[in-house]
């Protein structure tokens, strides 16, 4: 799996999970989130060569097509596979609200 | 929806469905498929700017992060959303086989 256990341990040009810490205030200009101040969002990036973690039959076909026709602009892309939620605390007026934001943290990647 | 009805009708630099016909023999070097000779596989390509068909909360966060921090290399990618199968005819010896290959045709795209 193209997850932290594999990707953060290996130097990898191909599609892999990349570390990304987002500070809500500094990076997004959000002041309304009280806790946490930021989080490990991570992201997916890297090349998708032939059979590198292909997600579907179509992405397999596309990576083969791209290998045989290197001038082609049609190639699979490295995107998130497994995501996890993030729980945040914010206030509406003086009332604290706890919200679970779905699909906020990328845990693994795929070529799609 | 970033499907043929929208994307093939509009000139679109952003993430959209692109037409791609794949000839099995010429483009993939496959001689074993008897019918069809090729098919409209299509593919997804284009930029994923702020709020353009964002698939998850993470891709929304990433597109905002990328907008506010344009020097960042972390940005969402244009990939397939809905896929359809393709039915093929091939032979094992002289025995005809009909097979439905899943997820072979891209029908719409998303920024993920």
């Amino acid at each position: 799996a193209l997850d932290a256990a594999y990707c953060f341990r290996n130097v990898q040009d191909n599609c892999c999970l990349r570390p990304l810490y987002i500070d809500f205030k500094r990076d997004l200009g959000w002041k309304w989130i009280h806790e946490p101040k930021g989080y490990n969002a991570n992201f997916c990036a890297g090349a998708c060569p032939y059979l590198w973690s292909s997600d579907t039959q179509h992405s397999r076909v596309l990576s083969l097509y791209n290998t045989i026709n290197p001038e082609a602009s049609a190639s699979p892309c490295c995107v998130s596979q497994d995501l996890e939620p993030l729980t945040i605390l914010y206030y509406i007026g003086k009332t604290p609200k706890i919200e679970q934001l779905s699909n906020m943290i990328v845990k693994s990647c795929k070529c799609s | 929806a970033l499907d043929a009805a929208y994307c093939f009708r509009n000139v679109q630099d952003n993430c959209c469905l692109r037409p791609l016909y794949i000839d099995f023999k010429r483009d993939l070097g496959w001689k074993w498929i008897h019918e069809p000779k090729g098919y409209n596989a299509n593919f997804c390509a284009g930029a994923c700017p702020y709020l353009w068909s964002s698939d998850t909360q993470h891709s929304r966060v990433l597109s905002l992060y990328n907008t506010i921090n344009p020097e960042a290399s972390a940005s969402p990618c244009c990939v397939s959303q809905d896929l359809e199968p393709l039915t093929i005819l091939y032979y094992i010896g002289k025995t005809p086989k009909i097979e439905q290959l899943s997820n072979m045709i891209v029908k719409s795209c998303k920024c993920s």
Epitope: K25, L28, G29, W30, K31, W32, Y90, I92, E99, L101 | L51, Q57, R60, V61, L64, I68
Partner: nanobody, 116 residues
Framework: QVQLVESGGGLVQPGGSLRLSCAAS????????MGWFRQAPGKQRELVAI???????NYADSVKGRFTISRETAKSTMYLQMNSLKSEDTGVYYC??????????WGQGTQVTVAS
């Protein structure tokens, strides 16, 4: 009921100025990232400028130095001051409100035409 109402569009000569407003109702305005988008005839909708809930701003390269985005929380209103207008600025300008906790909202648009 959420409403975003744009105003301030119109016909202006090249080099002229306009100030667009987007009045929001039915939302907790201070939590929303607000953006101006535009769509020229036969072209895709594109981001012109954004101001986050905390006041961070960003502009499309084509409008940097000419347009200024701002927000007034007390009035639940966002503005776009457009100076040195060019013919390529012509299009329908849409207001967008986005907060990750809910969905995002769009206004109906206001027409800006730059012509002599």
């Amino acid at each position: 009921q959420v409403q975003l109402v744009e105003s301030g569009g119109g016909l202006v000569q090249p080099g002229g100025s306009l100030r667009l407003s987007c009045a929001a109702s039915g939302i907790s305005f201070s939590y929303y990232d607000m953006g101006w988008f535009r769509q020229a005839p036969g072209k895709q909708r594109e981001l012109v400028a954004i101001v986050t809930s905390g006041g961070r701003t960003n502009y499309a390269d084509s409008v940097k130095g000419r347009f200024t985005i701002s927000r007034e929380t007390a009035k639940s209103t966002m503005y776009l001051q457009m100076n040195s207008l060019k013919s390529e600025d012509t299009g329908v300008y849409y207001c967008n409100a986005h907060w990750i906790v809910t969905t995002d909202y769009w206004g109906q648009g206001t027409q800006v035409t730059v012509a002599s």
